[in-house]
Amino acid sequence: MMTGTIETTGNISAEKGGSIILQCHLSSTTAQVTQVNWEQQDQLLAICNADLGWHISPSFKDRVAPGPGLGLTLQSLTVNDTGEYFCIYHTYPDGTYTGRIFLEVLESSVAEHGARFQIP
């Protein structure tokens, strides 16, 4: 029985060239988190394994930094980074929990971290 809930940073915007922290938090469950996968638009960005630590996909290692915590920091943002990001928590015994974050990378200085806009 999955009793937990994933809280995410939701819909966020950031400036081109800047950086952003993607964060998910699993609450309301005593399940053990064995691994967290971060995926961007069908591509694996990074894995944080409880035993083995962090692995960043080679194609993203120059622009992705682990943390804080189980979150992920994206750097040197481009407009092509606009899109959906998924945090996938693998837990025992509950199974997997999925959170979705939508990032919009803006050309101008209008962007505000955490600014909300119409889904997605």
Partner: nanobody, 116 residues
Framework: EVQLVESGGGLVQAGGSLRLSCAAS????????MGWFRQAPGKEREWVSS????????YYADSVKGRFTISADNAKNTVYLQMNSLKPEDTAVYYC?????????WGQGTQVTVSS
């Protein structure tokens, strides 16, 4: 710009099933991913599921995982959402959209009502 039209909604009893369709006016292969979203009365629109057209990867909100299945038929330029074991809390207007596009005009959607 690809136009999307949702259909397949209706009134169903709790525990029942529905299959929603999202027909595109052009080729969905020009869109990297498609998603289903829903909006219940008095609530914010929320993401339900996404499918990646080429890779085939699928993602689901925890509230529908194991009950809903998203799929894409490239030949028919249509995306589907098979909804099983429906619950009253699934009652909402369902919309499909390019899930990687930040802003757009929403279509009319299709109403799904689940009675207890």
């Amino acid at each position: 710009e690809v136009q999307l039209v949702e259909s397949g909604g209706g009134l169903v009893q709790a525990g029942g099933s529905l299959r929603l369709s999202c027909a595109a006016s052009g080729s969905i292969t020009s869109i990297r991913s498609m998603g289903w979203f829903r909006q219940a009365p008095g609530k914010e629109r929320e993401w339900v599921s996404s499918v990646y057209i080429f890779g085939g990867s699928t993602y689901y909100a925890d509230s529908v995982k194991g009950r809903f299945t998203i799929s894409a038929d490239n030949a028919k330029n249509t995306v589907y959402l098979q909804m099983n074991s429906l619950k009253p809390e699934d009652t909402a207007v369902y919309y499909c959209a390019n899930s990687n596009k930040p802003k757009f005009d929403w279509g009319q959607g299709t109403q799904v009502t689940v009675s207890s």
